[in-house]
């Protein structure tokens, strides 16, 4: 006979559960699907993660997002987890939000990113929600700084990237400081492929940076080079 | 060829001073920064501190309180001194030579690559 | 003080590749040293200015460095090149030599 009165709960469908901390009035719900939309835009060395929530939400309102990063070198074509390597606008674990920035992307290097979505019955089941986007990294490859002379009170650098990238380039940027002295550097703008850094100090030690500014932003920063200039017994401009 | 050769006492109390020193033989003596490094039993490599021919030096932040490195221009020789010991300084001390003169033609190397080490002195210090 | 991360251990089957990272903030502007060590013995240069080799050493070492991370790669890898590897920089805003923390390659 017809109990006179309903289940005070019922046993969950297949697919469908509780997680432990739900009450027992609760509806069974599911684990949701996959985010909907993934887009990864690449600027320089950072890409822009953007999702829509899973069309199927399991019938929960819990979701969270996890981002995991995987990088390919192009040459072998081997993979590995890069979370070592990379910086996330906020960890990437947990998300509730659906965007993230991943930065300190290295050039030429093929980066795949997975999003996955999960609610409060996913650990329950062993299958996954999730959806990858891949991006190249195509920022400028860093200068390559020569000293080409120096005199008491100058140094003149110039420096070269290959010339497929160079008309990406609309600026280069030349940070220079005196070796010791942290607290304060210098700036030069130039379209050029060389500059003369003057009103130096003689028989000093200079630490002078190169990089390439692109509409994308800022390509890699060439490495931090030490240039002196001549101590004051040394003669006149000469080259190296 | 150059060749580093090291020598100092091995053993040590609590409190003592480390005395080291690493004679030059061969190249160009006063074209470098010279390097202390050590090794405490089955971990890493630290640096120590590196001195030129004239006197100038850098130390590790981590020890500047200590030490203190000097040169010998006549004898081709630097010489470490680590004060106030501890069992904390055991470990194998080596000197080590940079790959490259420190500065040629304006292009300097600061913190270059160690192609040449010392044969290393085990120093332990012990009540 | 600038920080070098290295993983504390990397193994690999012989004649596979092995691939010892050193992690350190924009490491890709300075020029990263490698060093392998054997029980008992002074460090030896295997790789110097990222990715060149001093004379002596095999091609199957070789380096790159960009970004945040620099590799140091041993190719066909054999019994004898199990040691301790350990990456360097001279970190130019402290003006002081920093290694990192050291790889164990174990050879399966």
């Known amino acids: 006979l017809p109990s006179p009165e309903g289940a005070t709960s019922c046993e969950c469908e297949e697919g469908f559960f509780r997680a432990p901390q739900d009450p027992a009035s609760m509806p069974c719900t599911r684990p949701p699907s996959a985010p909907h939309y993934l887009t990864a835009v690449g600027m320089g060395a950072k890409v822009e993660l953007r999702w829509t929530p899973p069309q199927d939400s399991g019938g929960r309102e819990d979701i969270v997002y996890s981002v995991t990063c995987e990088q390919c070198w192009p040459e072998s074509g081997e993979c590995g987890p890069c979370e070592a390597s990379v910086r996330y606008s906020e960890p990437p674990h947990g998300l509730t939000r659906t965007s993230v920035t991943v930065s300190d992307l290295e050039p030429h290097m093929n980066y795949t990113f997975t999003v996955e979505a999960r609610n409060g019955v996913s650990g329950l089941v062993t299958s996954r929600s999730f959806r990858t986007a891949s991006v190249s990294i195509n920022q400028t490859e860093p200068p390559k700084v020569r000293l080409e002379g120096r005199s008491t009170t100058s140094l003149s650098v110039s420096w070269s990237i290959p010339p497929p990238q160079q008309s990406r380039v609309w600026k280069y940027e030349v940070t220079y400081r005196k070796k010791g002295d942290s607290n304060s550097y210098n700036v030069r703008r130039t379209e050029g492929f060389s500059v003369t850094l003057d009103d130096l100090a003689p028989d000093t030690t200079y630490l002078v940076q190169v990089q390439a500014l692109t509409q994308e932003g800022q390509g890699a920063g060439s490495k931090v080079h030490e240039f002196q200039t001549l101590s004051p017994e040394g003669s006149g401009n000469l080259a190296v | 060829q150059v060749q580093l050769q090291q020598w100092g006492a091995g053993l040590l109390k609590p409190s003592e001073t480390l005395s080291l020193t690493c004679a030059v033989y061969?190249?160009?003596?006063?074209?470098?920064?010279w390097s202390w490094i050590r090794q405490p039993p089955g971990k890493g490599l630290e640096w120590i501190g590196e001195?030129?021919?004239?006197?100038?030096?850098n130390y590790n932040p981590s020890l500047k309180s200590r030490v203190t490195i000097s040169v010998d221009p006549s004898k081709n020789q630097f010489s470490l001194k680590l004060t106030s010991v501890t069992a904390a300084d055991t470990a194998v001390y080596y000197c080590?030579?940079?790959?490259?003169?420190?500065?040629?033609?304006?292009?300097?190397?600061?913190?270059?690559?160690?192609?040449?080490w010392g044969q290393g002195t085990m120093v332990t210090v012990s009540s | 003080s600038y920080v070098l991360t290295q993983p504390p251990s990397v193994s690999v089957a012989p004649g596979q590749t092995a691939r010892i990272t050193c992690g350190g903030n924009?490491?890709?502007?300075?020029?990263v040293h490698w060093y392998q060590q054997k029980p008992g013995q002074a460090p030896v240069l295997v790789v110097y200015?990222?990715?060149d080799r001093p004379s002596g050493i095999p091609e199957q070492f070789s380096g790159s460095n960009s970004g945040n991370t620099a590799t140091l790669t041993i190719s066909r890898v054999e019994a004898g090149d199990e040691a301790d590897y350990y990456c360097?920089?001279?970190?130019?805003?402290?003006?002081?030599?920093?290694f990192g923390g050291g790889t164990k390659l174990t050879v399966l």
């Open positions: 061969g190249g160009s003596f006063s074209d470098y920064y």
């Open positions: 200015d990222d990715s």
């Open positions: 080590a030579k940079p790959f490259r003169p420190h500065c040629t033609n304006g292009v300097c190397y600061s913190g270059d690559a160690f192609d040449i």
């Open positions: 001195i030129n021919h004239s006197g100038s030096t």
């Open positions: 360097q920089v001279w970190d130019s805003s402290s003006d002081h030599l920093v």
């Open positions: 924009n490491i890709g502007t300075k020029n």
